[in-house]
């Protein structure tokens, strides 16, 4: 049965074997076309989602779909099923947390009072002041909460308790990339992980350990990619997969929290990058110990300059290393995460590309997550 | 199995527009990318632009922006290519080609090719 | 644009022979380099994609090596329906092809 399922596809009606390499190769070689059902799938960028979490202590904002123009959500009158029907609109299933904050002096959009109408947020029509003078603060899911704060050093030994949304991502039982735990459903990595492997069957993920072999597997339901542009073929490096049970939350296992849609990342912020990957450039072996490192925001412009990357960093991408070189990410850390750390930690960028490894003049090459929160949101509305 | 299947042949006169169809069966339609690639008489191939059936997003070459358009009808597998303002040098064999894959690919399954002559 | 050149332009061989064709990519294409064969009235067919891979069905003679950007296909024993033009396409950024290889009997 093991050799089988390793080497075989059972195809239905009627019952046949095919060969597991002709899965997801394009042609249908199972009469009723399932040995190309269960393949990695591409999912448009779709419409721009109506609500939006900023990061002023994550209040609630509205888009006006007739002006295009964005309100902050006043608190008068917001009740628990304007909360969940907010956070449904991005895609999320949990019961959501919020809290009244008081307008601050910077506010600078519109502040209105918010109903409902089929299943989504709009603005009341007859909406006259903020009379609480608060503004809606919500939380869609806990997330981004560690038991462990790392210290700041160099590169070091990492422990599942500060990073338990990391997870390993195998094929066939070897480590390809890492991941992050986004909610029980779903974890965030890189596209590029799936490009040698496109059926979704033999793809797994280990959860709440710092060791690579020694956590149990877990099965994957589907694999998402957003749609890949030849003529930009590093925009994009993003992809969601759908676990086929979902997670119990624990010490070990968590979410880390998705970034807000203007978080803007200074020159110089500090980062974290963790990782299995190789431990030198183009060198030995994936390093079975999690390894985390502290790094910062490389300057864009600095990132495109002629003895770098030469203008493919693109405004979906974001650079981070350490000026001197030394500390970067390397591969099979691809589809890990770039965090930054307010309150919670915050997935900010995901391990895509570089040359080479630690180079100090070509630093890593990031996915910008606030770049594809819509594809995110999108992608999780279909499939609630 | 995989097959591409394109419209007939067309005669044009410069100025003119033409559009040719390709018909995919035995697979995933909107699981794969289609390529545009076009050969003059005794030249080489020349790419020319390429359309995701998922999406309907398209991408073209730099010296075709503007005149070519491809377009998709999902409920028949069919992609379509229209050229524009037609002159005598797009007198050429027009093939519709598959993305192997939806990452970077090669082009593994082609059309049997469309002639298409521009001439007054 | 990334620009590809061939060399040679033309190529004659005995059958039985081995044939080495070249591409070489004017930036580094990765290993996203594919291969292509073309028979006078006929479409092209796929022999090597990610510059060593064979597509379904083609023969073991043809075998496809480097990266970056220098490439090259091997013909180890020609056949008699060898006798074709062969194109290189890279499809790192976008797609672009060579402008061919005429491989002719000797």
């Known amino acids: 049965k093991v050799i089988l399922d390793k080497y075989y596809f059972l195809c239905g009606q009627p019952l046949h074997f095919i060969p597991r390499k002709q899965l997801c190769d394009g042609e249908l070689d199972c009469p009723l076309g399932e040995d190309e059902e269960h393949c990695v799938k591409s999912f448009p960028e779709g419409p721009a989602v109506a609500v939006r979490l900023s990061k002023d202590r994550s209040t609630l904002q509205v888009l006006d779909s007739a002006t295009g123009n964005w309100f902050s959500a006043c608190f008068d009158n917001f009740t628990e099923a304007l909360a969940e029907t907010a956070c449904r609109q991005m895609g999320y299933s949990s019961k959501p947390t919020f809290r009244a904050v008081e307008i601050g002096p910077d506010q600078d959009l519109d502040v209105v009072e918010i109903t409902e109408n089929s299943q989504e947020l709009r603005m009341r029509n007859s909406s006259g002041p903020c009379l609480s003078g608060s503004l809606v603060s919500l939380h869609c899911l806990a997330c981004g909460k560690s038991l462990k704060t790392p210290r700041v050093v160099g590169v070091e030994e990492a422990s599942v308790d500060s990073w338990p949304w990391q997870v390993s991502i195998q094929y066939d039982k070897q480590h390809v990339c890492g991941g992050s735990i986004l909610d029980p459903h779903w974890v965030l990595t890189a596209a590029h992980c799936f490009r040698k492997h496109t059926d979704v069957f033999n793809w797994k993920v280990r959860a709440g350990s710092d060791k690579l072999g020694s956590f149990p597997s877990l099965a994957v339901a589907k694999i998402i990619i957003i749609e890949f542009n030849p003529m930009y073929p590093k925009d994009n490096d993003i992809a969601l997969m759908k676990l086929q049970f979902p997670l119990t939350f624990s010490g070990t296992v968590r979410p880390i929290c998705l970034p807000f849609f203007d978080e803007e990342l200074t020159p110089a912020t500090p980062l974290w990058i963790i990782g299995w990957g190789f431990t030198k450039q183009n060198g030995g072996k994936m390093s079975d110990i999690l390894l985390q490192a502290s790094v910062q925001v490389i300057d864009s412009t600095r990132c495109n300059a002629d003895d770098a990357y030469q203008g493919e960093v693109t405004e979906k991408m974001m650079c981070a290393g350490i000026p001197e070189g030394g500390v970067d990410t390397c591969q099979g850390d691809s589809g890990g995460p770039l965090m930054y750390q307010s309150d919670q930690w915050h997935v900010v960028g995901i391990v895509s590309w570089g040359y080479g490894c630690g180079g100090p003049s070509t630093p890593g090459v990031y996915t910008k997550v606030s770049a594809y929160l819509n594809w995110i949101y999108n992608v999780w509305k279909a499939e609630l | 199995q995989v097959q591409l299947v394109q419209s007939g042949a067309e005669v044009k006169k410069p100025g003119a527009s033409v559009k040719v169809s390709c018909k995919a069966s035995?697979?995933?339609?909107?699981?794969?990318?289609m390529h545009w690639v076009r050969q003059a008489p005794g030249q080489g191939l020349e790419w020319m632009g390429w359309m995701n059936p998922n999406s309907g997003n398209t991408g073209y070459a730099q010296n075709l922006q503007g005149r070519v358009t491809m377009t998709r009808d999902t409920s028949t597998s069919t992609v379509y290519m229209e050229l524009s303002s037609l002159r005598s040098e797009d007198t050429a064999v027009y093939y519709c080609a598959r993305g192997r894959t939806w990452f970077r690919s090669g082009m593994d399954v082609w059309g049997q090719g469309t002639t298409v002559t521009v001439s007054s | 644009e990334i620009v590809m050149t061939q060399s040679p332009a033309t190529l004659s061989v005995s059958p039985g022979e081995r044939a080495t064709l070249s591409c070489r990519a004017s930036?580094?294409?990765?290993?996203?380099l594919a291969w292509y064969q073309q028979k006078p009235g006929q479409a092209p067919r796929l022999l090597i994609y990610g510059a060593s891979t064979r597509a379904t069905g083609i023969p073991a003679r043809f075998s496809g090596s480097g990266s970056g950007t220098e490439f090259t296909l091997t013909i180890s024993s020609l056949q008699s329906e060898d006798f074709a033009v062969y194109y290189c396409?890279?499809?790192?950024?976008?797609?672009?092809f060579g402008p061919g290889t005429k491989v002719d009997i000797k």
């Open positions: 035995g697979y995933t339609f909107t699981n794969y990318y």
């Open positions: 396409q890279q499809y790192d950024i976008s797609v672009t």
């Open positions: 930036q580094s294409v990765s290993s996203y």
